[in-house]
Interface confidence: medium
């Protein structure tokens, strides 16, 4: 899709290098309930199962983030055994969080990027042949 | 880990119901390069492969978000055929984005939650057996 130019020419596009560095944020979160059906058992039923680890930081918003760690190097086969001809690998996602700029904290935050593992998937290993 | 109390008692905890609704954000993003190894081929090498679809919105930050769509209902077996005894399912992650509050846009944004599919994993269907 082509870039839609905002109606007010003084408003730079959010993808632009001129996007304002200091903005006011309303933290009444839109879509507070994203209403997803909780896929709470995928991490156990996957052929590349994972455990969820709680990452907590009170100086960050959101303060709790769950991170996935693959249980095995290989993948679970139909017999329930770990097959090392395949690999369990984390699927990572870059997310935005808000970080308090200083401990004496007037309502001032810094946007921060975090790389989190959301779950795991089973992949065929890369086999390089010589010659 | 226990909650760390911010040093200034006037600063509510970011996980708290009293977290400020209007804050100032510095958009000089920390960790701009999260230095992830680009898992660009997992989507093809996975037993539950996926395609990545570009979701673009100039009124949002980040303006481009990539969404995963599983290629198959089943999973790819060792012979490269789709096996319907297993299911490819999307792994979803709730992320925060910034949404411009109005078209005439003084530097005012709203925090918004989005549910995005990051990749796919292969799971065993729920078949409940008794006894």
């Amino acid at each position: 899709a082509g870039i839609v130019i905002p109606q007010n020419p003084e408003c730079p596009n959010t993808g632009d290098k001129n996007f304002p560095q200091n903005v006011k944020i309303n933290l009444n979160v839109l879509n507070r309930k994203t209403n997803s059906r909780r896929a709470s058992d995928y991490h156990n039923r996957s052929t590349s199962p994972w455990n969820l680890h709680r990452n907590e930081d009170p100086e960050r918003y959101p303060s709790v983030i769950w991170e996935a760690k693959c249980r095995h190097l290989g993948c679970v086969n139909a017999e329930g055994k770990v097959d090392f001809h395949m690999n369990s690998v984390p699927i990572q996602q870059e997310i935005l969080v808000l970080r308090r700029e200083s401990q004496n904290c007037p309502h001032s935050f810094q946007l921060e990027k975090m790389l989190v593992a959301v779950g795991c998937t089973c992949v065929t290993p890369i086999v390089r042949h010589m010659g | 880990a226990g909650i760390v109390i911010p040093q200034n008692p006037e600063c509510p905890n970011t996980g708290d119901k009293n977290f400020p609704q209007n804050v100032k954000i510095n958009l000089n993003v920390l960790n701009r390069k999260t230095n992830s190894r680009r898992a660009s081929d997992y989507h093809n090498r996975s037993t539950s492969p996926w395609n990545l679809h570009r979701n673009e919105d100039p009124e949002r930050y980040p303006s481009v978000i990539w969404e995963a769509k599983c290629r198959h209902l089943g999973c790819v077996n060792a012979e490269g055929k789709v096996d319907f005894h297993m299911n490819s399912v999307p792994i979803q992650q709730e992320i925060l984005v910034l949404r411009r509050e109005s078209q005439n846009c003084p530097h005012s944004f709203q925090l918004e939650k989005m549910l995005v599919a990051v990749g796919c994993t292969c799971v065993t269907p729920i078949v409940r057996h008794m006894g």
Epitope: - | E67, A68, R71, L73, P90, I126, H129
Partner: antibody, heavy 120, light 107 residues
């Protein structure tokens, strides 16, 4: 309450085309696989098409493959079935069906159906 | 394709009685079997999945059993509201086929 309401059925000549629609409500549409199942005049049930929750993957039995296309619009909570090169054996009641939990094989909620008649 | 055979097209049972509806696959389906009930003029309704697991809201007088190729749906203490056609469906192998149905009537 889960509701599935089909529309778009009618009388079509052999070789013709038709698009069925289904409006879903009462559940998080974007979280479920959806399907079309038809019931022939002799009351036999036959799976026609399945689409997964985010629309990324589909399945068709050989009887309709290449002629029917299932699609969905999660923003509109709608499911569609585009049918072309219709044959008399496609005459049936077409049900819009929600797939059970997270595996697209078992069908837990059914609409009331819309009738397709293929005849010259 | 896996064929699902419901040998009885019709069954006539007394009120309060017990009925067993059978479904046979021409290959192993490893308990990946569902049962549906269709009352006259209505759409089908899922009763059981995984050959034995009752769906929420289904009365406990319904039960499923079986393994391998052979499966049964049992209804104890038959009620008038149980008058319907019952279909089995295998979901072990595409194209996830249905049986031809067994119509239950009251004697």
């Amino acid at each position: 309450e889960v509701q599935l309401v089909e529309s778009g059925g009618g009388l079509v000549q052999p070789g013709g085309s038709l698009k069925l629609s289904c409006a879903a409500s009462g559940f998080t549409f974007s979280s479920y696989g959806m399907s079309w199942v038809r019931q022939t005049p002799d009351k036999r049930l036959e799976l026609v098409a399945i689409i997964n929750s985010n629309g990324g993957s589909t399945y068709y039995p050989d009887s309709v493959k290449g002629r029917f296309t299932i699609s969905r619009d999660n923003d509109k909570n709608s499911l569609y079935l585009q049918m072309s090169s219709l044959k008399s054996e496609d005459t049936a009641m077409y049900y819009c069906v929600r797939c059970h939990y997270d595996y697209e094989r078992v069908f837990d909620y059914w609409g009331q159906g819309t009738t397709l008649t293929v005849s010259s | 394709d896996i064929q699902m055979t419901q040998s009885s097209s019709y069954l006539s049972v007394s009120l309060g009685g017990r009925v067993t509806i059978t479904c046979k696959a021409n290959d192993h389906i490893n308990n990946w079997l569902a049962w549906y009930q269709q009352k006259p003029g209505n759409a089908p309704r899922l009763l059981i999945s995984g050959s034995t697991s009752l769906e929420t809201g289904v009365p406990s007088r319904f039960s499923g059993s079986g393994s391998g190729k052979d499966y049964t749906l049992s209804i104890t203490s038959l009620q008038t509201e149980d008058v319907a056609t019952y279909y089995c469906q295998q979901y072990w192998s595409t194209p996830f086929t249905f049986g031809s149905g067994t119509k239950l009537e009251i004697k």
